[in-house]
């Protein structure tokens, strides 16, 4: 990996678990400049592998609301608008980091957690397995 | 929102910016149980809107490595294996949270940051706009 010199202005850490426990500023900086969310907002409907979005809420997690994609069909939509079962709609999944309140119900203490979320769906050729 | 009673065993926060600055345990808890990553790992190749994955590395960010999807074609792959330009491959984007070292190069001080990543691609019917 890349070694970076430590900034002398860094806060001290007296925590015995350092570097496992760190200070995090929750004042979110949004780097998503020049993006037009409207453009991708309707892909879930226009896709050949359309999906529905389900709200997953957990007050012990930050962010507390996460949207999960569920593919509408097993097959994909063909040119005639019908479901074609020769192809399959599959979820595209991504591992994301969230903050979990630990101990529970604490406003200022968290633990990093890795969760798998389905972001949308794509249309794939199924792999054929010959079974006995 | 849901109000949760505060746990009396919570750590104290003497930070003047509380609750903006919190303690986070970086010992990641992985909730991805019963998932088979092999199943979705080759969707990028089998999709009708295939994509390539590009490594984005930033030592000032946690996680330092993020994989970005770039659609291979403007069109989608048809049943004959050719690119069909009546349809479009588009990236499915998701906003994710990362930790940014702040001040820079500090090992134990971070700020939450929201970034937009492309997770994969899906095949959509293009919207036709009639312009003058």
């Amino acid at each position: 990996g890349i070694t970076i010199p430590r900034n002398p202005g860094c806060p001290n850490s007296e925590d015995k678990n350092f570097p496992r426990t760190v200070m995090v500023n929750l004042n979110i900086h949004n780097r998503n400049t020049n993006t037009n969310p409207k453009r991708s907002s309707d892909y879930y409907n226009r896709s050949t592998s359309p999906w529905n979005l389900h709200r997953n809420e957990d007050p012990e997690r930050y962010p507390s609301v996460i949207w999960e994609a569920k593919c509408r069909h097993l097959g994909c939509i063909n040119a005639d608008g019908n479901v074609d079962y020769h192809m399959n709609s599959v979820p595209i999944q991504q591992e994301i980091l969230v903050l979990r309140r630990e101990p529970p119900h604490c406003p200022n203490s968290f633990r990093l957690e890795k969760i798998l979320v389905s972001v949308g769906c794509t249309c794939v050729t199924p792999i054929v397995h010959h079974v006995a | 929102g849901i109000t949760i009673p505060r746990n009396p065993g919570c750590p104290n926060s003497e930070d003047k910016n509380f609750p903006r600055t919190v303690m986070v345990n970086l010992n990641i808890h992985n909730r991805n149980t019963n998932t088979n990553p092999k199943r979705s790992s080759d969707y990028y190749n089998r999709s009708t809107s295939p994509w390539n994955l590009h490594r984005n590395e930033d030592p000032e960010r946690y996680p330092s490595v993020i994989w970005e999807a770039k659609c291979r074609h403007l069109g989608c792959i048809n049943a004959d294996g050719n690119v069909d330009y009546h349809m479009n491959s588009v990236p499915i984007q998701q906003e994710i949270l990362v930790l940014r070292r702040e001040p820079p190069h500090c090992p134990n001080s971070f700020r939450l940051e929201k970034i937009l990543v492309s997770v994969g691609c899906t095949c959509v019917t293009p919207i036709v706009h009639h312009v003058a």
Epitope: L74, Y85, N88, S89, V90, P126, I127, V128, H129, V131 | -
Partner: nanobody, 116 residues
Framework: QVQLVESGGGLVRTGGSLRLSCSVS????????MGWYRQVPGRQRELVAM????????YYADSVKGRFTISRINANNTIYLQMNNLKPEDTAIYYC?????????MGQGTLVTVSS
């Protein structure tokens, strides 16, 4: 591991009927389907009929609509394909399939021969 056990193929005269059955065991998700493909040697495999595991939605190839009926007994994950008014062009090896999103499991096949 998915396992498929097929039965019910055979020789039948034009206009006759046959019933195929197939039982599936193993990991079955809520977003899966069971069905039948058929193949004539040297030709492309054709999806004949399919039934969704939980929704019960059915799909039929145009060539068999009105003649073939797919049904399912949920309790033991068994599907049936009732084939009526059979034609010589229905002659093929019929494969029971279990389709999980992205993966298609196919049985060993059962031969259906329709003689004129």
């Amino acid at each position: 591991q998915v396992q498929l056990v097929e039965s019910g193929g055979g020789l039948v005269r034009t206009g006759g009927s046959l019933r195929l059955s197939c039982s599936v065991s193993g990991d079955i998700s809520s977003q899966s389907a069971m069905g039948w493909y058929r193949q004539v040697p040297g030709r492309q495999r054709e999806l004949v009929a399919m039934i969704h595991t939980t929704k019960g939605d059915t799909y039929y190839a145009d060539s068999v609509k009105g003649r073939f009926t797919i049904s399912r007994i949920n309790a033991n994950n068994t599907i049936y394909l009732q084939m009526n008014n059979l034609k010589p062009e229905d002659t093929a090896i019929y494969y029971c399939t279990h389709n999980e999103p992205g993966d298609l499991y196919m049985g060993q096949g059962t031969l259906v021969t329709v003689s004129s």
